[in-house]
């Protein structure tokens, strides 16, 4: 039975040209996290395997930095980066947990962090 919940940074906004940390946290479970995959719609951004380390997709290699922790730092933001991002936690023995973050990249300096929320 899957008892865990994924807490994410929720709906966030950031300035064009700036950077943002995409962060998820798995709680309420003793399951072991074996791997976290970061995806954007139909594209893989990165994989963090507990044993094998990081894989960064070539299309993001120049502007994605691993971490902090299992998170991902997205740099040199453009308006095209606006959209949904998913953290997919592969765990043993629970299985897969998925968190969603919506990022809006703004032209001006009115960017603000949204509220944190949970996905069961």
């Amino acid at each position: 039975m899957m008892t865990g919940t994924i807490e994410t940074t929720g709906n966030i906004s950031a300035e064009k040209g700036g950077s943002i940390i995409l962060q998820c946290h798995l709680s309420s479970t003793t399951a072991q996290v074996t791997q976290v995959n970061w995806e954007q719609q139909d594209q893989l951004l990165a994989i963090c395997n507990a044993d094998l380390g990081w894989h960064i997709s070539p299309s993001f290699k120049d502007r994605v930095a691993p971490g902090p922790g299992l998170g991902l730092t997205l740099q040199s933001l453009t308006v095209n980066d606006t959209g949904e991002y998913f953290c997919i936690y592969h765990t043993y023995p629970d299985g897969t947990y998925t968190g969603r973050i919506f990022l809006e990249v703004l032209e001006s300096s009115v960017a603000e962090h949204g509220a944190r929320f949970q996905i069961p």
Partner: antibody
Framework: QVQLVQSGAEVKKPGASVKVSCKTS????????MHWVRQAPGQRLEWIGG????????SYNQKFQGRVTITVDTSASTAYMELSSLRSEDTAVYYC????????????WGQGTTVTVSS | DIQMTQSPSSMSASVGDRVTITCKAS??????VVWYQQKPGKAPKLLIY???YRYTGVPDRFSGSGSGTDFTFTISSLQPEDIATYYC?????????FGGGTKLEIK
């Protein structure tokens, strides 16, 4: 240039163990993950597992869990794969392969080591 | 484990032909797919990584595409030296798994 040189062919009896080595050169050993892949005659490639030489972290295919041990000697820039309780279906060519920096694609491979298990 | 199903398992084509090989994953693997070429008695060689990126030194007649579960590998104009077996592989989640291979022969 990058080179992965594996140990020679082995013939083993069922129930025995085999240890295959993979000596590397031409790159910084600890910066690249090392994998082991095998290919039985006429069969598809099969991933056995990998090791991160930087921290010794290993990931194994469950199919081989308990029978396989992947290790490294960082001072010798060498990786090892030991497979125990051998059976005839373990007869295969065993390859070491490194995966690139920040990339899981296996970009350089050893020449292969033939392991024959026969009574 | 994720199953990678390649088709066709073998095919013959003429020099200059456009050759297409498909690979279907049993579940979502995003763009975490690699294509290798293997010649008899030799180790595999990396051709395409992250579904569509050509590895250093690989001729531009080789290309890859796809995302999710369906992937395609194409040789735009077959050359005699392309005779080999081609494998797809996923690294979306361990254990990494390979397709059954496509053996390419010259007509």
């Amino acid at each position: 240039q990058v080179q992965l040189v594996q140990s020679g062919a082995e013939v083993k009896k069922p129930g025995a163990s085999v240890k295959v080595s993979c000596k590397t050169s031409g790159y910084t050993f600890t910066e690249y993950t090392m994998h082991w892949v095998r290919q039985a005659p006429g069969q598809r490639l099969e991933w056995i597992g990998g090791i991160n030489p930087n921290n010794g972290g290993t990931s194994y295919n469950q199919k081989f869990q308990g029978r396989v041990t992947i290790t490294v000697d960082t001072s010798a820039s060498t990786a090892y794969m030991e497979l125990s309780s051998l059976r005839s279906e373990d007869t295969a060519v065993y390859y070491c392969a490194r995966s690139g920096n920040w990339d899981y694609a296996m970009d350089y491979w050893g020449q292969g080591t033939t392991v024959t298990v026969s009574s | 484990d994720i199953q990678m199903t390649q088709s066709p398992s073998s095919m013959s084509a003429s020099v200059g032909d456009r050759v297409t090989i498909t690979c279907k994953a049993s579940q979502h693997v995003s763009t975490a797919v690699v294509w290798y070429q293997q010649k008899p008695g030799k180790a595999p060689k990396l051709l395409i990584y992250s579904a569509s990126y050509r590895y250093t030194g690989v001729p531009d007649r080789f290309s890859g595409s796809g995302s999710g579960t369906d992937f395609t590998f194409t040789i735009s104009s077959l050359q005699p030296e392309d005779i080999a077996t081609y494998y797809c592989q996923q690294h979306y989640i361990t254990p990494w798994t390979f397709g059954g291979g496509t053996k390419l022969e010259i007509k």
